[in-house]
Amino acid sequence: LRHVVYWNSSNPRLLRGDAVVELGLNDYLDIVCPHYEGPGPPEGPETFALYMVDWPGYESCQAEGPRAYKRWVCSLPFGHVQFSEKIQRFTPFSLGFEFLPGETYYYISVPTPESSGQCLRLQVSVCCKERKSESAHPVGSPGES
């Protein structure tokens, strides 16, 4: 399964902090950065860094502690940028994360200083068994940029 999340401030669930996706092992979390055609909004485009954090970091929307890992940067608002996280028990990459069934993982974005963005939050709940590849419902939509 591939779970697509359109990561931008027009996504009310990310903004409210009640967005939860349930993933199984071998699923993918696809994060789609904000994308603008033409000049973009008058307040300027959203740019931010995405972090995997612990519960206190998620609650306070802070990404400064030792358990706050920078994962990706959405800094090209006029390009089509997407990042993928494979939900796997063991990772072959030094920068990859190991996901345990039954655990919840927390993602937040912190706007860059020049950005119009706000704090966005997502919980990823990892379920029990491995799944074959297929697609799933997205969180948000491409129009929410």
């Epitope: 519960w55 206190p56 802070q62 400064e64 920078k70």
Partner: antibody, heavy 120, light 112 residues
Framework: QIQLQQSGPELVKPGASVKISCKAS????????IHWVKQRPGQGLEWIGW????????KYNERFKGMATLTVDTSSSTAYMQLSSLTSEDSAVYLC?????????????WGQGTSVTVSS | DVVMTQTPLSLPVSLGDQASISCRSS???????????LYWYLQKPGQSPKLLIY???NRFSGVPDRFSGSGSGTDFTLKISRVEAEDLGVYFC?????????FGGGTKLEIK
């Protein structure tokens, strides 16, 4: 004031288990990580792992996985560490410590330590 | 695991002297989020460690300003500008950037 009060000294036989406690007071127990550290005479300090009482998440030093088990009882604001299959190498003083949040992210308050002696 | 190497092992000083302790890590302590989680603790005989410096150079509350921390990357230093009797004990550096979190071997500050 903030205090971490640890249980008293333990004398245990090789192969046995022991459970030591760390009772917190003076702050909201569920809002701060608790760490456990091992100290052997003349051997410095070794980080065992942490537990977050707010959601019971744990992280262990691989060296202590399967040997140390961290738990909490939020009703009594107490953290526990169980050590199993003990050998003489596990004779040490075990310290609990609270990790403060932003901006420190440091172990700022410590228990007085619990001495564990493994001997037949 | 990240190895934290402290030098010297023992540091004999006269009261009022300046003391300097070095801590080197086997890899950079700059976290992916840009912060450096390097700390200094003092442990006096029969006591638990006390936090002196957090995140390289910040004095913890109640720590006298004669203590200062500096450094970056893999190379860090704790300085005591004028050693007092109450400063004697074992100093440990500690890193929380990489799991497992690790301590230096300690430096014993003693009277010459």
């Amino acid at each position: 004031q903030i205090q971490l009060q640890q249980s008293g000294p333990e004398l245990v036989k090789p192969g046995a288990s022991v459970k030591i406690s760390c009772k917190a007071s003076g702050y909201t127990f569920t809002g701060y990580y608790i760490h456990w550290v091992k100290q052997r005479p003349g051997q410095g300090l070794e980080w065992i792992g942490w537990i977050y009482p707010g959601n019971f998440n744990t992280k262990y030093n691989e060296r202590f996985k399967g040997m140390a088990t961290l738990t909490v009882d939020t009703s009594s604001s107490t953290a526990y560490m169980q050590l199993s299959s003990l050998t003489s190498e596990d004779s040490a003083v075990y310290l609990c410590a609270r990790e403060d949040g932003s901006p420190y992210y440091a172990m700022d308050y410590w228990g007085q330590g619990t001495s564990v002696t493994v001997s037949s | 695991d990240v190895v934290m190497t402290q030098t010297p092992l023992s540091l004999p000083v006269s009261l009022g002297d300046q003391a300097s302790i070095s801590c080197r890590s086997s890899q950079s302590l700059v976290h992916s989020n840009g912060n450096t989680f390097l700390y200094w603790y003092l442990q006096k005989p029969g006591q638990s460690p006390k936090l002196l410096i957090y995140r390289v150079s910040n004095r913890f509350s109640g720590v006298p300003d004669r203590f200062s921390g500096s450094g970056s990357g893999t190379d860090f230093t704790l300085k005591i500008s004028r050693v007092e009797a109450e400063d004697l004990g074992v100093y440990f550096c500690f890193q929380a950037t990489h799991v497992p979190w690790t301590f230096g071997g300690g430096t014993k500050l003693e009277i010459k």
